[in-house]
Interface confidence: low
Amino acid sequence: MVPPPENVRMNSVNFKNILQWESPAFAKGNLTFTAQYLSYRIFQDKCMNTTLTECDFSSLSKYGDHTLRVRAEFADEHSDWVNITFCPVDDTIIGPPGMQVEVLADSLHMRFLAPKIENEYETWTMKNVYNSWTYNVQYWKNGTDEKFQITPQYDFEVLRNLEPWTTYCVQVRGFLPDRNKAGEWSEPVCEQTTHDETVPS
């Protein structure tokens, strides 16, 4: 009897959907695996007789529930199928956006870049999929614990009237208000303001 794959799960970030599993202990030899998806009430092969412990399902429609399954095989024997269901638009993890930060005197000018979807056009981003897409921005004075959050209306934001010659750190994440779903924060970007541009009278 061939034991089934273990710890079967979907690792999906920005619609890069990788079905992953672990090979069970099996004394007779090396196992291979077959992973399938349900299409029109028929299961179709996606990865056949692979020695890998993952299978890329990034081409799945983003909308709707999908049934995926994987089994282990050895010679003419095989394990039972292990099934999971997955809805990309609901279940994918929203990865961190990109961010460009520029210091202009006592202001930080930020531009946000929605995460790309790897298996689509170069210009395709998560904003193309989620109509309610917005950004959360978090910023703080470097070395302090107090953080401030804002929700920009656009793909850019300016933090004005900051303390001169002070280092501020900024990070951004995607947020879907209609789903109350937040993405992963970007790595903090820390920049030092320069002088206050106001001219004395």
Partner: nanobody, 125 residues
Framework: QVQLQESGGGSVQAGGSLRLSCAAS????????MGWFRQASGKEREGVAT???????RYADSVKGRFTISKDNAKNTLYLQMNSLKPEDTAMYYC???????????????????WGQGTQVTVSS
């Protein structure tokens, strides 16, 4: 739930024309890619044409210059005008919709979320 209902199929002589329609309802998102696929007897389903929410279109090489995809947003209806029909165009034609912009992979039916029931087109020589 998105529902798609095709109409307009039928039998026609080679060189003739047909216009397929697809009435759509139940959208929960404002942006959809829509398209037409077809499946001839004993063959795999193949992409024919797609139209994005912004109106940009794409066609399979085999139908370029003969078929025109369009949509009427006010009526929530998708159309496929098929001219200069050939016997090899004989197939069941399906209306399809998927979320957001049309990806190049729309031509693989694996990637499409919503389907109509299909309408038969038969072209005789």
């Amino acid at each position: 739930q998105v529902q798609l209902q095709e109409s307009g199929g039928g039998s026609v002589q080679a060189g003739g024309s047909l216009r397929l329609s697809c009435a759509a309802s139940g959208y929960t998102y404002s942006s959809y890619c829509m398209g037409w696929f077809r499946q001839a007897s004993g063959k795999e389903r193949e992409g024919v044409a797609t139209i994005d929410s912004d109106g940009s279109t794409r066609y399979a090489d085999s139908v370029k210059g003969r078929f025109t995809i369009s949509k009427d947003n006010a009526k929530n209806t998708l159309y496929l005008q098929m001219n200069s029909l050939k016997p090899e165009d004989t197939a069941m034609y399906y209306c399809a919709a998927d979320l957001a912009d049309c990806a190049p992979s729309i031509y693989s039916d694996y990637d499409v979320a919503h389907w109509g029931q299909g309408t038969q087109v038969t072209v005789s020589s």
